[in-house]
């Protein structure tokens, strides 16, 4: 019995659902009562899911797996794995037995995009040409381990005096910290690029240092210039720092985080004490770091509604404030493609191809093209609907007149994550049915 699985690993983002495709060709007269289907971990042989005696025997894998019961009779033995975790990465074997027996293994490659790096300087004030400065580039919650590259403002690679460390958290996601030590010139731009080698996703930030004396007087409050990009459901750090003077104590500090537009209180620290979250109990300071001038705010389980500007007010004797923007994002799923009509197709027929991608944010950009890369812009209708969480489902419809044969591909881009998800369908020139019958 021939069992077919994809040659390439299935790449799945942490927290999303993945389909491990597996198919066989049922003979005429085949009934599900004859089918024994077992999914197991290739290495440990641990049972994941099974179908036997005409019945789905259910998930043996943390209750996160499912078959496609309506499609089994057509030979579709694929497995749906929900809420993918780093620990799921590896090889899964699909065993199919009817009268004969066959098996094949499919690899699951787990990935998570890295956050936009934050850059910190040490020391961060009174910098003069000739000073040695340590620039730290930190990017969070990615998988697998990142590749990190530094360069100056002219694109010259900086490879000396770089130390990069990567630490996995309990979920197996990596936080990467890369430290560059440089001697300051008259001025300089230093940029750090963090690459996810599986997603081929680049996250980069840069810092421009113009050595000079800081003006005395008001408290200088520093926040990132660029918006902080956070994935829905993850935690985000809104960075804010000030430079405490010698002899500074927390009893002198008044720190207030509030929504810039509405002035709604988010979190505060006064009278030497953390006054707690006033924002749905999802915020926290970094109490151990406050004395060093780190007034950053941690926002947990980010939602679409959190997007916007947050102001960090710091008062000691003097007063200063700065606003940081939070940009929320969620990756779009791999598009599914449907045809209407979907059978007995002939050249000259008009067909409607629908490309659907789910649960992304912000609104997607959708591009269609043919098999030669020629953009298809006529007869395209795209609609995007937000669900209760504010995440968008995108449906793009292309109407085409079939030629002898043709490939039509749809690319759904998340403009913030610069994440592309694409699907394609190839329609051959003889009478055919879609999806092709096994």
């Amino acid at each position: 019995l021939e069992v077919q699985v994809p040659e390439d690993p299935v790449v799945a983002l942490v927290g999303t659902d993945a389909t491990l495709c597996c198919s066989f060709s049922p003979e005429p007269g085949f009934s599900l009562a004859q089918l024994n289907l077992i999914w197991q971990l290739t290495d440990t042989k641990q049972l994941v899911h099974s179908f036997a005696e005409g019945q789905d025997q259910g998930s043996a894998y943390a209750n996160r797996t499912a078959l496609f019961p309506d499609l089994l009779a057509q030979g579709n033995a694929s497995l749906r794995l929900q809420r993918v975790r780093v620990a799921d990465e590896g090889s899964f074997t699909c065993f199919v037995s009817i009268r004969d027996f066959g098996s094949a293994a499919v690899s699951l490659q787990v990935a998570a995009p890295y956050s936009k790096p934050s850059m910190t300087l040490e020391p961060n004030k009174d910098l003069r040409p000739g000073d040695t400065v340590t620039i730290t580039c930190s990017s969070y919650q990615g998988y697998p381990e990142a590749e990190v590259f530094w360069q100056d403002g002219q694109g010259v690679p900086l490879t000396g005096n770089v130390t990069t460390s990567q630490m996995a958290n309990e979920q197996g996601l990596f936080d990467v910290h890369s430290i560059l030590r440089v001697v300051l010139g008259a001025n300089g731009t230093y940029s750090c690029l963090v690459r996810n080698p599986v997603l081929q996703q680049d996250a980069h930030s840069s810092v421009t240092i113009t050595p000079q004396r800081s003006p005395t007087g008001a408290v200088e409050v520093q926040v990132p210039e660029d918006p902080v990009v956070a994935l829905v459901g993850t935690d985000a750090t809104l960075r804010c720092s000030f430079s405490p003077e010698p002899g500074f104590s927390l009893a002198q500090l008044n720190l207030i985080w509030q929504l810039t537009d509405t002035k709604q209180l988010v979190h505060s620290f006064t009278e030497g004490r953390d006054q707690g979250s006033a924002y749905a109990n999802r915020t926290a300071l970094f109490p151990d770091l406050l004395a060093q001038g780190n007034a950053s705010l941690r926002l947990q389980r980010v939602r679409v509604a959190d997007e916007g500007s947050f102001t960090c007010f710091v008062s000691i004797r003097d007063f200063g404030s700065a606003a940081v923007s939070l940009q929320v994002a969620a990756p779009y799923s791999k598009p599914s493609m449907t045809l209407e009509p979907n059978k007995d197709l002939r050249p000259g027929d008009t067909v409607t191809i629908t490309c659907s991608s789910y649960r992304g944010y912000p609104e997607a950009e959708v591009f269609w093209q043919d098999g030669q890369g020629v953009p298809l812009t006529g007869n395209v209708t795209t609609s995007q609907m937000a669900n209760e969480q504010g995440l968008f489902d995108v449906h793009s419809v292309l109407r085409v007149v079939l030629g002898a044969n043709g490939t039509y591909s749809c690319l759904v881009r998340n403009p913030v994550l610069q994440q592309d998800a694409h699907g394609s369908v190839t329609i051959t020139g003889q009478p055919m049915t879609f999806p092709p019958e096994a």
């Epitope: 590749e147 590259f149 690679p157």
Partner: antibody, heavy 121, light 106 residues
């Protein structure tokens, strides 16, 4: 129009030196690094080194470090490459090129027309 | 030194054919650039920052990446594509080019 115009062809004796110029126009000369690349007859491209006309910082391919000097004259927006102790295997077309882009992606967007240097006794 | 190895060195292709050129880096690179050079001409920027087409480059050109392999694809070769193509990196010193792939039209 952004342009790099190089000096004319040179024929040199082994052991001598050659100095090739590259005049930039149409952009701020100090904003981008200028690189030098050579191509021997029928061969591929080989990087020699670069100069930052603003800071005058240079860096060289180890292979050319001892024999090459890169300089830049900001007043005339001209970069120079001098190669000494010439040997027959230095016979090549020498190109200057501007390394352009924006952080963190850069590439050679403008090339000079090339200067043929022939080393022959 | 990061060595870039292009394959094949030479390819003779019929118009309308699909062509692939692979540039394999000996270690990870921050990004890859590609240049096109025709006989007796200076190289021209062709693809920058791994997959962005330079100005005027036809959309039949594309690049895909798998690990340290960067693959340049010409979807349907045209006569004007006959040239030598070079990949280039500068993630660490020295800046290096691939040895080049020459495309000839049959």
């Amino acid at each position: 129009e952004v342009q790099l115009v190089q000096s004319g062809a040179e024929v040199k004796k082994p052991g001598s030196s050659v100095k090739v110029s590259c005049k930039a126009s149409g952009y701020s000369f100090t904003s981008y690094t200028i690189h030098w690349v050579r191509q021997a007859p029928g061969q591929g491209l080989e990087w020699i080194g670069y100069i930052n006309p603003n800071s005058r910082n240079t860096d060289y391919n180890q292979k050319f470090k001892d024999r090459t000097t890169l300089t830049a004259d900001r007043s005339t927006s001209t970069a120079y490459m001098e190669l000494s102790s010439l040997r027959s295997e230095d016979t090549a077309v020498y190109y200057c090129a501007r390394y352009s882009g924006s952080t963190p992606y850069w590439y050679f967007d403008v090339w000079g027309q090339g200067t043929t240097v022939t080393v022959s006794s | 030194e990061i060595v870039l190895t292009q394959s094949p060195d030479f390819q003779s292709v019929t118009p309308k054919e699909k062509v692939t050129i692979t540039c394999r880096a000996s270690s990870s690179v921050s990004y890859m650039n590609w240049y096109q050079q025709k006989p007796d001409q200076s190289p021209k920027p062709w693809i920058y920052a791994t997959s962005n087409l330079a100005s005027g480059v036809p959309s039949r050109f594309s690049v895909s990446v798998s690990g340290t392999d960067h693959t340049l694809t010409i979807n349907s070769l045209e006569a004007e594509d006959a040239a030598t193509y070079y990949c280039q990196q500068w993630s660490s010193n020295p800046l290096t080019f691939g040895q080049g792939t020459k495309l000839e039209i049959k």
